[in-house]
């Protein structure tokens, strides 16, 4: 997200359209308390950050309350009165959605429907990844709403699932972040398990009738 302007690298994350986090990495100013000044309107005076992030005792970022804002953040990172990085960015294009909540699994024979609470804003993809100990890598399926049906599962296998939310790139552009993954949940024969065995268990012999 940031090359260097006077040796400063920045990262912007807009958490769930609620909080903007701007962090900086300034090797030239590694032992300096840089200050963060911002405004949401190009004609206003700058405000100074009131919620700094610290790293090794020095300022390294700022958290801003920015509930459902879709405007431009004007900001200036300063060493005293000297600006070392000044920019203006549309915040919404650095969206990181929140992790899926209330994830539920509904099993029907060889298929499972994964649901969760849809976020309050749109243009998102809800991605479910799953694998069994027999799989070398995660399989993935995604939908526009948090209602994802995965078919063709083997009822005898144990599957691990997790879910995340991604902003659609053709809407929000290339600078967004996927949400954190939900907790891994393990299922076998429609029942929740503590874990799936790392090594595949041999199939149980079929009982003759």
């Amino acid at each position: 997200q940031g090359g260097a302007a006077e040796g400063v690298q920045i990262q912007i994350i807009y958490f769930n359209l609620e909080t903007v986090q701007v962090t900086w990495n300034a090797s030239k100013y590694s032992r300096t308390n840089l200050t963060f000044h911002y405004r949401f309107n190009g004609d206003e005076a700058y405000d100074q950050c009131t919620n700094y992030l610290l790293q090794e005792g020095h300022t390294s970022g700022c958290l801003l309350d920015a509930e459902q804002r879709d405007d431009i953040l004007y900001f200036s990172i300063r060493n005293g009165t000297h600006p070392v990085f000044t920019a203006s960015r549309w915040m919404v294009y650095y969206l990181k959605p929140s992790s899926p909540k209330h994830v539920r699994f509904s099993w029907h024979q060889d298929a499972v429907t994964v649901t969760c609470s849809d976020l309050s804003y749109g243009d998102l993809l809800y991605e479910v990844q799953y694998r069994s100990p027999f799989d070398t890598e995660w399989q993935s399926k995604q939908e526009n709403t948090c209602n994802v049906t995965i078919e063709g599962l083997d009822a005898e296998k144990c599957y691990s699932f997790w879910v995340r939310v991604k902003a659609m790139e053709d809407v929000y552009g290339p600078d967004t972040y996927p949400s954190d993954w939900s907790e891994v949940t393990c299922w076998q024969r429609g029942e929740i398990r503590d874990a799936c065995a790392e090594t595949p268990t041999p199939p149980k012999p079929k009982l003759s009738k």
Partner: antibody, heavy 117, light 107 residues
């Protein structure tokens, strides 16, 4: 498919007014910041104005501030530029463009505004 | 406002040539630099964003580099469809500003 279609250009006298429109389709219009960019005949590109997805925040180049007003109707997927107190130097092709911090991948075909007496 | 200076303003080249266009910002703009191609009577087309990222659908013979104040657009082997005018644009801070353009025509 994303489509942007400008209209409303034409010949206007200095001091007059024009209203440009940009009809958007193929995407969730209200999710996007939108821009107006202009290009005088034989010249380069000049950013004119921008508006946030909700329409709550607007931004202008100094050259048009106080004369032009950008607006949007998200229920009709329409972006507008009201141009008042027109000057000869406002003569240009006006483009609407959809984009983000990393460039503008979608542009309309442009509409020509000529300001002349 | 940040001024963007492009050079050269025009150049003549042949099909197969390697073409380099430079853009200089009046102050450091990190990597917030985009390149557009424009053909007569048409809207600009985004080629490169964030200094070096290739826009989807753009041929790989186009590449961008640079950070801070100096940036370069390179077309490794010019094709007939590449004869056009190229613009750089900074998206570091508003007002967003463009370079004056570089017209690439046939030698």
């Amino acid at each position: 498919e994303v489509q942007l279609l400008e209209s409303g250009g034409g010949l206007e006298q200095p001091g007059g007014s024009l209203r440009l429109s940009c009809a958007a389709s193929g995407f969730t219009f209200s999710s996007h910041a939108m821009n107006w960019v202009r290009q005088a005949p034989g010249k380069g590109l000049e950013w004119v104005s921008a508006i946030s997805g909700s329409g709550g925040s607007t931004y202008y180049a100094d050259s048009v501030k106080g004369r032009f007003t950008i607006s949007r109707d998200n229920s009709k997927n329409t972006l507008c530029l009201q141009m008042n107190s027109l000057r000869a130097e406002d003569t240009a092709v006006y483009y609407c463009a959809r984009g983000h911090n990393s460039g503008w991948p979608y542009w309309g075909q442009g509409t020509l505004v000529t300001v002349s007496s | 406002d940040i001024q963007m200076t492009q050079s050269p303003s025009s150049l003549s080249a042949s099909v197969g040539d390697r073409v380099t266009i430079t853009c200089r910002a009046s102050q450091s703009i990190s990597i917030y630099l985009n390149w557009y191609q424009q053909k007569p009577g048409k809207a600009p087309k985004l080629l490169i964003y964030a200094a070096s990222s290739l826009q989807s659908g753009v041929p790989s013979r186009c590449s961008g580099s640079g950070s801070g104040t100096d940036f370069t657009l390179t077309i490794s082997s010019l094709q007939p469809e590449d004869f056009a005018t190229y613009y750089c644009q900074q998206s570091y801070s508003t007002p967003l500003t463009f370079g004056g353009g570089t017209k690439v025509d046939i030698k």
